[in-house]
């Protein structure tokens, strides 16, 4: 699986999850998030050669098409597969609130 | 929606579904498919500027991150959203078989 366990341990050029730390205030302009100050959102990148973690029949077909037609511009792309939520603390005035934000952290990637 | 209705009618540079005809024999080397000879598989391509058909909170956050950090290499990618099946006819010996292959045709795209 093209997940953090594999990708963060290997120098993988092809489609894999990459570490990306986002600081809420500096990178997004979000002053309203109290904790954490930032988090590892991660992202997916790298080429999708034929059959690399293909998501659907279409991406498999497209990968094969590219292999046999190297000049083609149509190719699968490396995108998030598994995402996890992030729990944040923010304040409504003086009142603390805890919220779980869905689909905030990329854990693995696929070729789609 | 970044679907064939919209994308095939507009000269859209950003993420959109593009027409791609695949000839089973010539492009894939599949001699076993009798009918059709080929089909419009289509594909997704084009930049994913901030908030263009963002798929998840992560892709929205990543888009915002890119807007505020233009030098960043992490950005959402244009990939298939809705896929449709394709019905094919092939022969097992002299016996015709009809099969529906799932997820063969891209109908719309998203930024993921």
């Amino acid at each position: 699986a093209l997940d953090t366990n594999y990708c963060f341990r290997n120098l993988e050029e092809n489609c894999c999850v990459r570490p990306l730390y986002i600081d809420f205030r500096q990178d997004l302009g979000w002053k309203w998030v109290h904790e954490p100050k930032g988090y590892y959102a991660n992202f997916c990148s790298g080429p999708c050669p034929y059959l690399r973690s293909a998501d659907t029949t279409h991406s498999t077909v497209l990968g094969l098409y590219n292999t046999l037609n190297p000049e083609a511009s149509a190719s699968p792309c490396c995108v998030p597969q598994d995402l996890e939520p992030l729990t944040i603390l923010y304040y409504v005035g003086r009142t603390p609130k805890v919220e779980q934000l869905s689909n905030m952290v990329v854990k693995s990637c696929k070729c789609s | 929606a970044l679907d064939t209705n919209y994308c095939f009618r507009n000269l859209e540079e950003n993420c959109c579904v593009r027409p791609l005809y695949i000839d089973f024999r010539q492009d894939l080397g599949w001699k076993w498919v009798h009918e059709p000879k080929g089909y419009y598989a289509n594909f997704c391509s084009g930049p994913c500027p901030y908030l263009r058909s963002a798929d998840t909170t992560h892709s929205t956050v990543l888009g915002l991150y890119n807007t505020l950090n233009p030098e960043a290499s992490a950005s959402p990618c244009c990939v298939p959203q809705d896929l449709e099946p394709l019905t094919i006819l092939y022969y097992v010996g002299r016996t015709p078989k009809v099969e529906q292959l799932s997820n063969m045709v891209v109908k719309s795209c998203k930024c993921s």
Epitope: Y90, G93, E99 | T57
Partner: antibody, heavy 120, light 108 residues
Framework: EVQLVESGGDLVKPAGSLRLSCVAS????????MSWVRQAPGKGLQWVGY????????NYADAVKGRFTISRDNAKNTLYLQMNSLRVEDTAVYYC?????????????WGQGTLVTVSS | ETVLTQSPGTLSLSPGERATLSCRAS???????LAWYQQKPGQAPRLLIY???SRAPGVPARFSGSGSGTDFTLTISSLEPEDFAVYYC?????????FGQGTKLEIK
């Protein structure tokens, strides 16, 4: 230059519905919490509710809870106020505002306002 | 909800004079959850002071805010003709956000 421009105000009958829009420009729309504030003719200011960007967490004043919905289209840099089951006492100028940064905060930019009149 | 009471309701002064506007909260707001706005007829409110004492960008130095707990003050050191308007205080310590009923500053 930051600008907020409201539209959609109208004369509507009690129990009717209306949707107000607020187009923002001059800043990164998805970085700030946005609020609606209203002002009845000749009266003071009343907070209506807020929405947090991207995650779309919203909260409302008791007077409008269950009837009004705040949403935003980040791609269009637009804030909306959907008003249902309107009452005569909802008659006011409605202002779209940007907060300084926190969820509850001072409001550093205001639109010009749009008038909603609820009358039979 | 937190009730804000502004006084006086109307303040009649002449240009050049010092204006002192009061805002009292029904419960303590701490030291930094109060803002002041100015509103002229037919216009939207304009933020003057936030965090009880911080001036918003572009606000002249003659405007100053002070106070903590339940008692807050907006002071205009020397009134200019364009300062005559209605002034509102706003608390954002607790939900819902509330505003005072306003103080009308008029030319004497």
């Amino acid at each position: 230059e930051v600008q907020l421009v409201e539209s959609g105000g109208d004369l509507v009958k009690p129990a009717g519905s209306l949707r107000l829009s607020c187009v923002a420009s001059g800043y990164t729309f998805s970085s700030n919490v946005m609020s609606w504030v209203r002002q009845a003719p000749g009266k003071g200011l009343q907070w209506v509710g807020y929405v947090i960007p991207i995650v779309d967490i919203a909260n409302y004043a008791d007077a409008v809870k269950g009837r009004f919905t705040i949403s935003r289209d980040n791609a269009k840099n637009t804030l909306y106020l959907q008003m249902n089951s309107l009452r005569v006492e909802d008659t006011a100028v409605y202002y779209c505002t940007r907060t300084l940064g926190l969820v509850l905060d001072a409001m550093d930019y205001w639109g010009q306002g749009t008038l909603v009149t609820v009358s039979s | 909800e937190t009730v804000l009471t502004q006084s006086p309701g109307t303040l009649s002064l002449s240009p050049g004079e010092r204006a002192t506007l009061s805002c009292r909260a029904s419960q303590s707001l701490g030291s930094s959850y109060l803002a002041w706005y100015q509103q002229k007829p037919g216009q939207a409110p304009r933020l003057l002071i936030y965090g009880a004492s911080s001036r918003a960008p572009g606000v002249p130095a003659r405007f100053s805010g002070s106070g903590s707990g339940t008692d807050f003050t907006l002071t205009i050191s020397s009134l200019e003709p364009e300062d005559f308007a209605v002034y509102y205080c706003q608390q954002y310590a607790d939900s819902p956000i509330t505003f005072g009923q306003g103080t009308k500053l008029e030319i004497k």
